[in-house]
C-alpha cells in the first residue's frame, strides 16, 4: 500500500510586506494523497473560521492538487505576525508559515523635555523610523537647520519585528541660544510625522 504524502507549495513569497490598511491574500497549492481531511489557517493560536477558501484542481478521484487561500483585509499595524496553514490526511500532517509584516507610517509616541535639558522624541512605525531634528528660528515652522542627536536607540529590537519598531532620539536643548521651535521628524518608507516644540514647551503634533 502506498504511503500517503502532502507537499505544500506557496504561491507567493512566505515573507510578505503589506501597507497598513491594505489587503493581502496568502495562497498555497498543495498535493495530498490520500485526500486531505482537515485544513486550517492559524494566527496567534487562533483558528480562522472564515476568510479562507479551499478547493481541488479537479474533482476526479485521481486528483491530488488543491489550493487554499486566506484573505486578509485592511490589515492593521497590530496584525503582523506568523500566519500558518496546516493540512492533514489519514497518513501525514504538513504546515507552512507566512511571516507578514505590516508597513506603518511613524507616529510620535512621546515628545518631552527631560530634567537634564535634553529633548527626547519617541516614534513607532514599520519599517523602523528614522528621527531627524531641525531648529526653526523665531516663530517659523519651516525648519531647515538640522541638529545632530546626542543619542539614538531602538527600544524593542528583540524578537521578530512583526509589530511597530520604537525608536528614541534625544538632543541637547542647551545648544540653542535663540528663541525658536524644534522639529522632531520621524519618517520611513510609508510616510512621515513631525512634532514641534517651542521654548514655552507646548507640544503640538502635526501628521503630514
Amino acid at each position: 500500500v502506498d504511503k500517503g504524502f502532502i507537499n505544500i507549495f506557496p504561491m507567493i513569497n512566505t515573507t510578505v510586506f503589506v501597507n497598513d490598511g491594505e489587503n493581502v491574500d496568502l495562497i498555497v497549492e498543495y498535493e495530498a494523497f490520500p485526500k486531505p481531511e482537515h485544513q486550517q489557517w492559524i494566527y496567534m493560536n487562533r483558528t480562522f473560521t472564515d476568510k479562507w477558501e479551499d478547493y481541488p484542481k479537479s474533482e476526479n478521484e485521481s486528483n491530488i492538487r488543491y489550493v487554499s487561500e486566506l484573505h486578509l483585509t485592511r490589515l492593521k499595524g497590530t496584525e503582523g505576525g506568523t500566519y500558518t496553514f496546516l493540512v492533514s490526511n489519514s497518513d501525514v500532517n504538513a504546515a507552512i508559515a507566512f511571516n507578514v509584516y505590516v508597513n506603518t507610517k511613524p507616529e510620535i509616541l512621546t515628545y518631552d523635555r527631560l530634567v537634564n535639558g535634553m529633548l527626547q522624541c519617541v516614534a513607532a512605525g514599520f519599517p523602523e523610523p528614522t528621527i531627524d531634528w531641525y531648529f526653526c528660528p523665531g516663530t517659523e515652522q519651516r525648519c531647515s537647520a538640522s541638529v545632530l542627536p546626542v543619542d539614538v536607540q531602538t527600544l524593542n529590537s528583540s524578537g521578530p519585528p512583526f509589530g511597530k519598531l520604537v525608536v528614541q532620539s534625544s538632543i541637547d536643548s542647551s545648544a540653542f541660544k535663540h528663541n525658536g521651535t524644534v522639529e522632531c521628524k520621524a519618517y520611513n518608507d510609508v510616510g512621515k510625522t513631525s512634532a514641534y516644540f517651542n521654548f514655552a514647551f507646548k507640544e503640538q503634533i502635526h501628521p503630514h
Epitope: M11, D25, E53, Y55, P56, K57, E59, V67, E69, H71
Partner: antibody
C-alpha cells in the same frame, strides 16, 4: 468535464443595461472563486470582476466600478454580471472564468456585448 | 494598477523553432504571473501558472521562468498548433489583475 456557458449578450444602446449569466457544470461550483474577463474586438484581455466562493466578497476593475455588479447563485450553479450605464467602450466578448489560485483555469466560450446607438 | 508589457508584439517562426516571449511588470509581482494561449475566435487557454508551473494537459515543450518583474514563456520546438496569440497576466494585485497586450506567433 468542466463547462462554463455564458448567455445574455446582445446589442444595447449607450446608457442601457444588460445581465449576463454563466451556467457552470462538471464541478462543485460553490467551492470556487469566479471571474468575468472581457476582450474588445481585436484587442487584449481585461479582467472585469471577481467573486469569492461564498459570494461574500467581490472586486471590480476601476473601469466598471459603480456600474457593474457581479453575483452568484450557488444553488443554481450560476454566475451573473449586471451591467448598467453601458458605454461604447464596454463593447467586448465577455468570458466567465473559474479561478485556481490566481490563474483562470477554465473559460467559457464568451458572449458578445455590443453597445451602440 | 500594475502595467504589463510584452515583447515582441508579433514574431514569425517556423515549425521546430525555439521561441521565447518576454513579459515585464511595472513593479515586482513575485511569481504571480500566468501565461495563456488564444486562437482566433476561441477563449484563452491557461498554459503556465505561478510563473513556472505547467497546467494539466499542456505539452512539456512549453515552459515558464522568471520572478519579480521579468518573465519568459519558452516554446522549445514550435508545432503547427502553437501558432496563436499569447498573453501574460499578473495577479499580484487583487483587485487590479492585468494582462499584457499579447504576442502573436505567426508562420514564417
Amino acid at each position: 468535464e468542466v463547462q462554463l456557458l455564458e448567455s445574455g449578450g446582445g446589442l444595447v444602446q449607450p446608457g442601457g443595461s444588460l445581465r449576463l449569466s454563466c451556467a457552470a457544470s462538471g464541478f462543485t461550483f460553490s467551492r470556487y472563486p469566479m471571474n468575468w474577463v472581457r476582450q474588445a474586438p481585436g484587442k487584449g484581455l481585461e479582467w472585469v470582476s471577481g467573486i469569492r466562493s461564498s459570494g461574500g466578497a467581490t472586486s471590480y476593475a476601476d473601469s466598471v466600478k459603480g456600474r457593474f455588479t457581479i453575483s452568484r447563485d450557488n444553488s443554481k450553479n450560476t454566475l451573473y454580471l449586471q451591467m448598467n450605464s453601458l458605454r461604447a467602450e464596454d463593447t467586448a466578448v465577455y468570458y466567465c472564468t473559474r479561478s485556481f489560485g490566481r490563474a483562470f483555469d477554465y473559460w467559457g466560450q464568451g458572449t458578445l456585448v455590443t453597445v451602440s446607438s | 494598477d500594475i502595467q504589463m508589457t510584452q515583447s515582441p508584439s508579433s514574431l514569425s517562426a517556423s515549425v521546430g523553432d525555439r521561441v521565447a516571449i518576454t513579459c515585464r511588470a511595472s513593479q515586482s509581482i513575485d511569481t504571480y504571473l500566468n501565461w495563456y494561449q488564444q486562437k482566433p475566435g476561441k477563449a484563452p487557454k491557461l498554459l503556465i501558472y505561478a510563473a513556472s508551473k505547467l497546467e494539466d494537459g499542456v505539452p512539456s515543450r512549453f515552459s515558464g521562468s522568471g520572478t519579480g518583474t521579468d518573465f519568459t514563456l519558452t516554446i522549445r520546438s514550435l508545432q503547427p498548433e502553437d501558432f496563436a496569440s499569447y498573453f501574460c497576466q499578473q495577479s499580484y494585485s487583487s483587485p487590479g489583475i492585468t494582462f499584457g497586450p499579447g504576442t502573436k506567433v505567426e508562420i514564417k
